[in-house]
């Protein structure tokens, strides 16, 4: 039975040219996290494997930095970075937990962080 929940940074916004941290946190389960995948729509951005550490997709190697923790830092943001991001936690024995974050990249300097929320 999957008892865990994923808490994410929720809906967030940031300025063009700036950077943003995407964060997810898995709680309420004792399952072992074997790997976390970060995806943008269907594109794999990065992997954090419990044994092998961080691996960043070549498509994002100049703009993505691992961490903090299991999170991901996106740099040099462009308007094209607007969209859905998913943190996919592969765990044992529970299986897979997925969190969703919506990022809006703004032209102006009125970017504000959204509230945190939970996905069961």
């Amino acid at each position: 039975m999957m008892t865990g929940t994923i808490e994410t940074t929720g809906n967030i916004s940031a300025e063009k040219g700036g950077s943003i941290i995407l964060q997810c946190h898995l709680s309420s389960t004792t399952a072992q996290v074997t790997q976390v995948n970060w995806e943008q729509q269907d594109q794999l951005l990065a992997i954090c494997n419990a044994d092998l550490g961080w691996h960043i997709s070549p498509s994002f190697k100049d703009r993505v930095a691992p961490g903090p923790g299991l999170g991901l830092t996106l740099q040099s943001l462009t308007v094209n970075d607007t969209g859905e991001y998913f943190c996919i936690y592969h765990t044992y024995p529970d299986g897979t937990y997925t969190g969703r974050i919506f990022l809006e990249v703004l032209e102006s300097s009125v970017a504000e962080h959204g509230a945190r929320f939970q996905i069961p």
Partner: antibody, heavy 118, light 107 residues
Framework: EVQLVQSGAEVKKPGESLKISCKGS????????IGWVRQMPGKGLEWMGI????????RYSPSFQGQVTISADKSISTAYLQWSSLKASDTAMYYC???????????WGQGTLVTVSS | SYELTQPPSVSVAPGQTARITCSGD??????ASWYQQKPGQAPVLVIY???KRPSGIPERFSGSNSGNTATLTISGTQAEDEADYYC??????????FGGGTKLTVL
């Protein structure tokens, strides 16, 4: 110690089938990709395809798609490369190698020499 | 299909710097790796993810990758560095391709 041990040399006739193997040891077999690389006599390296034994996700080079099949049995930490109908042009040394995601192939098998001749 | 182009041969005097290039369309958007192969032996990884060096590989080996060109640099080349060198590119979907290879001769 990380090791990839490949099956022995094979001599086959055109039209015959073949399955060669690559057994991994000394590491978590399901955490790394296993790739297959062809080297024809006196020629360069050619990437054939790759498999992730953890979930059997497989990618092929367009040049080898439909010509060979890559598979893995994670219960015995072994990857396979097989042909249903060999051609003389399949004569080559075949290497298996492991890679962590986007990293390069950091450990290689010793190679399996396949000779196809009538 | 994607192709990588290397010079067939490069010569260098002992102690000098050897540079082997690898070119491909938007190669800088992929990860470049470099392999050394000596006669009768399996290849050995000398550079991965553009510029990282595996443990056990001497510091004289370095790599870079931007635009359409990846470069393997061997500083203070030694006789034992004489070998064939292959570049490889890996894209976001884990697909790879090798260059045609460069024979490095240490004069």
């Amino acid at each position: 110690e990380v090791q990839l041990v490949q099956s022995g040399a094979e001599v086959k006739k055109p039209g015959e089938s073949l399955k060669i193997s690559c057994k991994g040891s000394g590491y978590s077999f399901t955490s790394y990709w296993i790739g297959w690389v062809r080297q024809m006599p006196g020629k360069g390296l050619e990437w054939m395809g790759i498999i992730y034994p953890g979930d059997s996700d497989t990618r092929y080079s367009p040049s080898f798609q439909g010509q060979v099949t890559i598979s893995a049995d994670k219960s015995i930490s072994t990857a396979y490369l097989q042909w249903s109908s060999l051609k003389a042009s399949d004569t080559a040394m075949y290497y298996c190698a492991r890679a962590a995601w986007w990293q390069g192939f950091d450990h290689w098998g010793q190679g399996t020499l396949v000779t196809v001749s009538s | 299909s994607y192709e990588l182009t290397q010079p067939p041969s490069v010569s260098v005097a002992p102690g000098q710097t050897a540079r082997i290039t690898c070119s491909g369309d938007a190669l800088g958007d992929k990860y470049a790796s470099w392999y050394q192969q000596k006669p009768g032996q399996a290849p050995v990884l000398v550079i991965y993810e553009d510029s990282k060096r595996p443990s056990g590989i001497p510091e004289r080996f370095s790599g870079s990758n931007s635009g359409n060109t990846a470069t393997l640099t061997i500083s203070g080349t030694q006789a034992e560095d004489e070998a064939d060198y292959y570049c490889s590119a890996k894209d976001a979907s884990f697909n790879s391709v090798f260059g045609g290879g460069t024979k490095l001769t240490v004069l």
